[in-house]
């Protein structure tokens, strides 16, 4: 029954979607952004305990004009899932509870078999989400690859499919800057560089504050970070523009310490106006 | 950026509203941006290692506008925008590190002081 006039069950199981998702709530998932290649998902390693894998399987005729050719009932329809060491099976969810398949995994949760129906009827379509634990992902993990294989005892040639995600470690650093003041004025008389004794001789004062905040783990485990400021010290013809008097880093060194940046500013060794600090 | 006058359409700026502006407003046409990224200025990069960076750090940089250059080069200019840029870089053996929003642009507006008469 369900195998057409020739009594041979020629199914057409297709894995039409296999994409990684972020789990928003128990049954709500959001697809991960895609890499520029359009086929690889981007997974940010930033404390997500699980990742979802959205799977959509259909059993529809390959040619709607010749529906009798295939798309028959798929008996003992299954999806076999092979997980990498970095991912472990943790559960299955479906938007429609009636579509939720029975999924069983081996002892170390690296291999999963999901029963899609016996049979998975002609015209059927099922969407569900595998919930995969990310606890095995380390900073050395660069890619996630899950191998997926549909299986049935009905007549159909089936080939493995891979779902891929590129893993990156997103440093949750934010940077913001302000100038004090936001507007400057120039006036007076032209004076040569050698006439400058004190910073007050140079022109209007300006202070820049650049704040960096780290919402994640300490950077010590990941490498060394640098805060850089591109300081426009001269105009295109080589004349001074903004003269750098003092550069100090606060908070990147430990309590109360002021970090040293390179190169050193105030190369003309002008007298510092301490009232401005 | 800050404008001394009322707000205008983007790209249009006015000098501070003083009737005795040293250069006539007809002459004061240009709005110039001095920005190393556009090649209109040259930059020195101050680089500060964040040795024990757990939560936050603030870079404080004090500077002075080089008055003489502005008097010589820009006294007939309507307004100048000076751009300072800052970013974070991370050196790591980890290949798949990614920084998002790791740069910022800080503009400052510069005008000929309307309160002062320029001495030649």
């Amino acid at each position: 029954q369900g195998c057409g006039e020739d009594k041979i069950c020629q199914s057409n199981l297709q894995l039409v979607r296999a994409r990684f998702c972020t789990r928003v709530s128990d049954t709500e998932f959001q697809p991960l952004p895609m890499d520029v290649d359009g086929t690889t998902a981007l997974f940010a390693l930033s404390g997500q305990p699980v990742i979802g894998l959205e799977l959509m399987v259909t059993n529809l005729p390959s040619d709607p004009a010749q529906p009798q050719a295939d798309g028959d009932d798929a008996h003992e329809a299954q999806l076999l899932v092979m997980l990498p060491d970095s991912l472990h099976y943790s559960g299955v969810r479906a938007l429609d509870p009636a579509e939720k398949p029975l999924c069983l995994s081996n002892e170390n949760a690296s291999h999963v078999e999901c029963e899609l129906g016996n049979p998975m009827k002609r015209g059927a379509q099922v969407t569900f989400y595998l919930i995969l634990s990310t606890s095995g992902i380390s900073i050395e993990t660069t890619e996630l690859e899950v191998e997926l294989l549909l299986a049935t005892i009905s007549e159909q040639e089936l080939h493995p499919v891979s779902a891929r995600a590129r893993v990156f470690i997103e440093l949750p650093l934010s940077i913001a800057g302000m100038a004090i003041p936001q507007q400057l004025f120039f006036s007076g008389v032209v004076r040569g560089e050698r006439a400058m004794q004190s910073e007050r001789d140079v022109g209007s004062k300006v202070k820049y504050e650049v704040t960096v905040s780290n919402q994640g783990q300490s950077l010590r485990t990941l490498g060394s970070a640098f805060l850089n400021i591109m300081w426009p010290h001269e105009i295109a013809n080589g004349k001074w523009l903004l003269y750098p008097m003092q550069v100090e880093l606060e908070g990147g060194q430990g309590p109360g310490q002021k970090g040293l940046c390179s190169p050193r500013p105030n190369i003309l060794h002008l007298d510092v106006d301490s009232r401005d600090r | 950026e800050l404008e001394p006058p009322e707000q205008q359409e983007p790209g249009e700026r006015q000098e501070p509203s003083m009737s005795w502006w040293p250069v006539s407003s007809a002459e004061k046409k240009k709005n110039i941006t001095l920005d190393c990224a556009r090649g209109t200025a040259n930059c020195v990069v101050f680089s500060c290692p964040l040795y024990s960076f757990d939560r936050a750090a603030v870079l404080h940089v004090w500077g002075r506008l080089w008055n003489s250059t502005f008097l010589e080069e820009y006294s007939a200019v309507k307004s100048l925008e000076v751009i300072v840029r800052a970013n974070i870089t991370v050196k790591s053996s980890i290949k798949n590190l990614m920084l998002r929003d790791a740069s910022t642009v800080i503009p400052v507006m510069v005008y000929l002081d309307p309160m002062a008469v320029v001495a030649e």
Partner: antibody, heavy 119, light 108 residues
Framework: EVQLVESGGGLVKPGGSLRLSCAAS????????MNWVRQAPGKGLEWVSS????????YYADSLKGRFTISRDNAKNSLYLQMNSLRAEDTAVYYC????????????WGQGTMVTVSS | SSELTQDPAVSVALGQTVRITCQGD??????ASWYQQKPGQAPVLVIY???NRPSGIPDRFSGSSSGNTASLTITGAQAEDEADFYC???????????FGGGTKLTVL
Amino acid sequence: EVQLVESGGGLVKPGGSLRLSCAASGFTFSSYTMNWVRQAPGKGLEWVSSISIVGNYIYYADSLKGRFTISRDNAKNSLYLQMNSLRAEDTAVYYCARRKWEHDAFDIWGQGTMVTVSS
Amino acid sequence: SSELTQDPAVSVALGQTVRITCQGDSLRSYYASWYQQKPGQAPVLVIYGKNNRPSGIPDRFSGSSSGNTASLTITGAQAEDEADFYCTSRDNSGNHVVFGGGTKLTVL
């Protein structure tokens, strides 16, 4: 929820001392310059003091003449104001306020704590 | 130290437009920020920078700047806008903050 809660206000005699505290929650306290602002009864707002992220840069209103000391404990997410040699004119509601990173603006304020200096 | 001057009181008819001004030498160099304070409550930031509104502040509030004067404009004033409004900026030293004396807005 981003919140600042002041405490430590009360009645104190002229010449006395008081230490105000401000407990921060809901944000990375150590990333922000913090301020104290006060408001005498029926009067306007007056800036008192500011402290940078780890306390390297501290500023006070000129009128305070070294009687007040601002400090912070980032491990406890707390801001403090030690007030000595108090005078009747220091009677006010004292607010702690967070300064936005990229602007000179106080975007988060506490509800204030009342300090009354009276004999 | 710098001073910022505000009109002590301003009134506006319901639904009309009102402008509150703030004058001071430091405003030639610094943006003003504006705060609304209702009786018994802490101040609330309404405008900062060139003309930025924090989230939750209605778009009837706007800011502008000209010379040494900053202005807060409320277009279509509502009854709930009745409050004291304060401007602030840094003083000319760049290290201190100065507040204006405040403007009491009455919505008629």
